[in-house]
């Protein structure tokens, strides 16, 4: 028997087609990817095969103006247009509060929506009751298949998920749910969640009973064969792992931001196991067309957003690299413009002795979500910006000994290369790492700009001396493991609107060109 | 749980034609096809035939004059007919989900007059 | 038709040996090999799908490898209750069985 799974995973508002780079749709011609276009394949597979599943693996929340504006009404909408069979809970479900993923998704979704490892307490616990589920049995054909979900445990320090949440680990939680499938007699099990690619991996080790892993929060791009874009495969698709009872288990992912559509084929053996499993992401490019009824409405929702913020702030003459391939590995210039500007917002010469209050600046590289293209005539957007700083946050004045910034620039590389968000932008800094240290000493040179000082310059940091430092809102609050910023942070005054702040500076300076200029060695 | 079982007579006459019933449970006709497999005492497995889950069949060359498989879906039964049997068929005859991942305990079957 | 070629056809061994048994394809069968253990009895029963993957209950002593047209069954430490009769299984056309390994105790 054979199952096809088409999949998607980090789709966030990309619900118009984008650039190749997922950034703003400026040649449409070349574009990519939408609601629009994953309709059309999914349709096209649905009438060409018999049993198919429609899943998403998280994270359909947060990314470009429409979450801006409709908060999740539009996810709920077109994900029920588009008739997926399940969802499971990304981290980002959660980044307007429990409130902002209840009322305009878990109450207005046509399909089930999973998280075994998210338990509910207190209030809260009556209310969300039935709103999502641990595993749901889905019919396909003749067949019944288990779809089981998890949700990183790490989204209370990525998002909001507020206090009557309890986030399990993943394996812990998986394996009862599970348990319970086998003994209702679905032989056939698809862990369908939002924990990166390397649980996903030890789920498939480690959970016994789940055919299929397919994940999502990686951004995992994986392909059997030559690439048709511009990623760059982690592994084969599927990537097999070796379950710890012998049994050869499937895992993919569809890299992000509904670019491609993941298409795996799975055929089952009469006891439930997989015999073989087969397939490729389909990159969704402009060969495939738009659906006319979806495009439709997109084009009706989208008169609001126009309302909302199309209007030009400023220009920029050079490419804005806010990658994640860069700005999660290196100094990116678009962290460097949003540092600049982050500084100028707080720009008060209250005391001759020094030029400035706060000099410095620290951005995580995993809040800078897209690129902006310079060759869309220059122009930037408040939607632009949207993409780039999606998550509503606020950018914050904290006062930090020495000793706990030198403690944040070592998490910001304690796991290098593993394209987490947690790598430091910086402004106002100069870091260099040597990472053939081991993790905790690989900062071998810090300095800071002064403030006490009528011409900046950069001195050593001090450990004992109280910093002034700008940044956003989610490292004060001990996002991306930065526990030591929120436990050992001396003051904090909440600051103005992150897209508003750089806004400001790009509507002030007109023109700006960034460079990448050795903040980051 | 998934499980197969053969049925039928352990004993045939020479010309005569074999009925053998294998009966289902734990999972649908309609998704999965039915293995016929036979062997001779002391010899080896030798594959008959196999009726697919959208009902079609495919056999062995050697047996294709004499054997025909059917099945009842609604009654989760498959039935193989082998005709003119002859003595050098006396063998355990078994069925077998289409991936052999089951197999049924297998009948033995005498040709004898 | 695809021919499945088995070898040993027997062997003798002790408890604790390890034990090889190969299977080689006349064409390319693509890891669509099953591998049977068949007690005195008759009973068959699958140990190995797909090439390599252990079915439900099957001790660990038990791997199966290869690709293409080679495929090996091992028994790591060979167990009293192994002393049994193998056969391979080719499923990517019309089924076809290796001739059967018989392992017997030394």
């Known amino acids: 028997w054979e199952l096809t799974i088409l999949h998607t995973n980090d789709v966030h508002s990309r619900l118009e087609q984008t650039s190749e780079d997922s950034s703003k749709c400026v040649n449409a011609s070349r574009c990519m990817g939408g609601v629009a276009r994953l309709f059309t394949k999914v349709q096209q597979i649905r009438r060409a095969e018999p049993n198919v599943l429609l899943l998403d693996a998280g994270d359909q929340y947060q990314g470009t103006i429409w979450f801006t504006v409709y908060k999740g009404a539009e996810v709920a909408h077109f994900m029920n247009a588009l008739r997926y069979d399940a969802m499971a809970l990304g981290n980002h479900e959660f980044d307007n509060g429990v409130e902002g993923l209840i009322e305009p998704l878990l109450k207005e979704a046509k399909f089930p929506i999973l998280s075994a490892n998210i338990k509910a307490k207190g209030p809260l616990a009556s209310q969300i009751s039935g709103l999502y589920l641990p595993y749901k049995v889905l019919p396909v054909g003749d067949e019944v298949v288990g779809i089981v979900g998890y949700t990183s445990k790490e989204t209370p320090f990525l998002s909001n998920p507020g206090t009557n949440l309890v986030f399990e680990d993943e394996i812990t939680a998986l394996q009862p749910e599970v348990d319970k499938l086998k003994t209702l007699n679905v032989n056939k099990i698809i862990a369908l969640g939002h924990s990166g690619f390397e649980m996903d991996k030890l789920i498939a080790q480690k959970v016994r009973g789940v055919d299929v892993v397919v994940g999502g929060h990686s951004n995992t791009f994986l392909y059997t064969g030559n690439p048709p874009s511009k990623e760059v495969p982690a592994g084969k698709y599927p990537f097999i792992v070796t379950s710890d009872d012998g049994r050869k288990v499937p895992v993919v992912q569809a890299y992000a931001f509904g670019k491609y559509l993941g298409y795996l084929k799975i055929e089952f053996d009469e006891r439930g196991n997989v015999i073989s499993s087969h397939g490729n992401p389909i990159l969704l490019n402009s060969s495939i067309p738009e659906d006319p009824s979806i495009k439709a409405d997109i084009n009706k929702w989208r008169i609001k957003l126009d309302n909302y913020s199309t209007q030009e702030l400023g220009k920029t003459i050079v490419y804005l690299d806010g990658s994640s391939q860069s700005c999660r590995f290196r100094e990116c210039n678009m962290g460097n413009l949003i540092c600049d500007a982050m500084i100028n917002n707080n720009l008060r010469h209250t005391d001759e002795m020094f030029w400035n209050h706060v000099s410095m600046c620290i951005l995580n590289g995993g809040g800078i979500r897209s690129p902006i293209d310079e060759r869309n005539n220059g122009t930037i957007t408040w939607e632009n910006l949207a993409a780039v700083l999606p998550f509503g946050g606020t950018f914050d004045l904290v006062q930090l000994k020495g000793s706990t910034l030198k403690k944040a620039f070592e998490h910001s590389v304690h796991r290098y290369g593993q394209s987490t968000g947690e790598f430091l932008q910086v402004g106002g800094i100069h870091v260099v790492y040597d990472l053939s240290r081991k993790p905790g000493d690989r900062v071998v040179k810090l300095d800071v700009l002064c403030t006490k000082c009528r011409v900046p310059s950069y001195d050593p940091l001090k450990m004992d001396e109280v910093y002034k430092v700008i940044l956003p809102n989610f490292l004060a609050n001990g996002g991306d493991g930065f526990q030591m910023i929120k436990d050992e942070l001396l003051r904090h005054d909440s600051g103005d609107q992150d897209i508003n702040v750089v806004s400001t500076y790009i509507s002030k300076m007109k023109v700006i060109y960034p460079a990448v200029e050795g903040r980051i060695k | 749980e998934v499980t197969l079982k053969e049925s039928g007579p352990v004993l045939v006459k020479p010309t005569e034609t074999l009925t053998l019933t294998c009966t289902v449970s734990?999972?649908?006709?309609?998704?999965?096809?039915i293995q016929w497999v036979r062997q001779p005492p002391g010899k080896l497995l030798e594959w008959l035939g196999v009726?697919?889950?959208?009902?079609?069949?495919d056999y062995n060359a050697a047996f294709i004059s004499r054997l025909t498989i059917s099945k009842d879906t609604s009654k989760s039964q498959v039935v193989l007919t082998m005709t003119n049997m002859d003595p050098v068929d006396t063998a355990t005859y078994y069925c077998?989900?289409?991936?052999?991942?089951?197999w049924g305990q297998g009948t033995l079957v005498t040709v004898s007059s | 038709d695809i021919q499945m070629t088995q070898s040993p056809s027997s062997l003798s061994a002790s408890v604790g040996d390890r034990v090889t048994i190969t299977c080689r394809a006349s064409?390319?069968?693509?890891?669509?090999l099953n591998w049977l253990q068949q007690k005195p009895g008759g009973a068959i029963k699958r140990l190995i799908y797909?090439?390599?993957s252990l079915d439900s209950g099957v001790p660990k002593r038990f791997s199966g490898s290869g690709s293409g047209t080679e495929y090996t069954l091992t028994i790591s430490s060979l167990q009293p209750e192994d002393f049994a009769t193998y056969y391979c299984?080719?499923?990517?056309?019309?089924?076809?069985f290796g001739g059967g390994t018989k392992v017997e105790i030394k």
């Open positions: 077998a989900g289409q991936y052999g991942s089951v």
């Open positions: 009726i697919w889950s959208g009902g079609s069949a």
């Open positions: 299984l080719q499923y990517a056309g019309s089924w076809t």
């Open positions: 734990g999972f649908s006709l309609k998704s999965y096809g």
């Open positions: 797909a090439t390599s």
């Open positions: 064409q390319d069968i693509g890891d669509r």
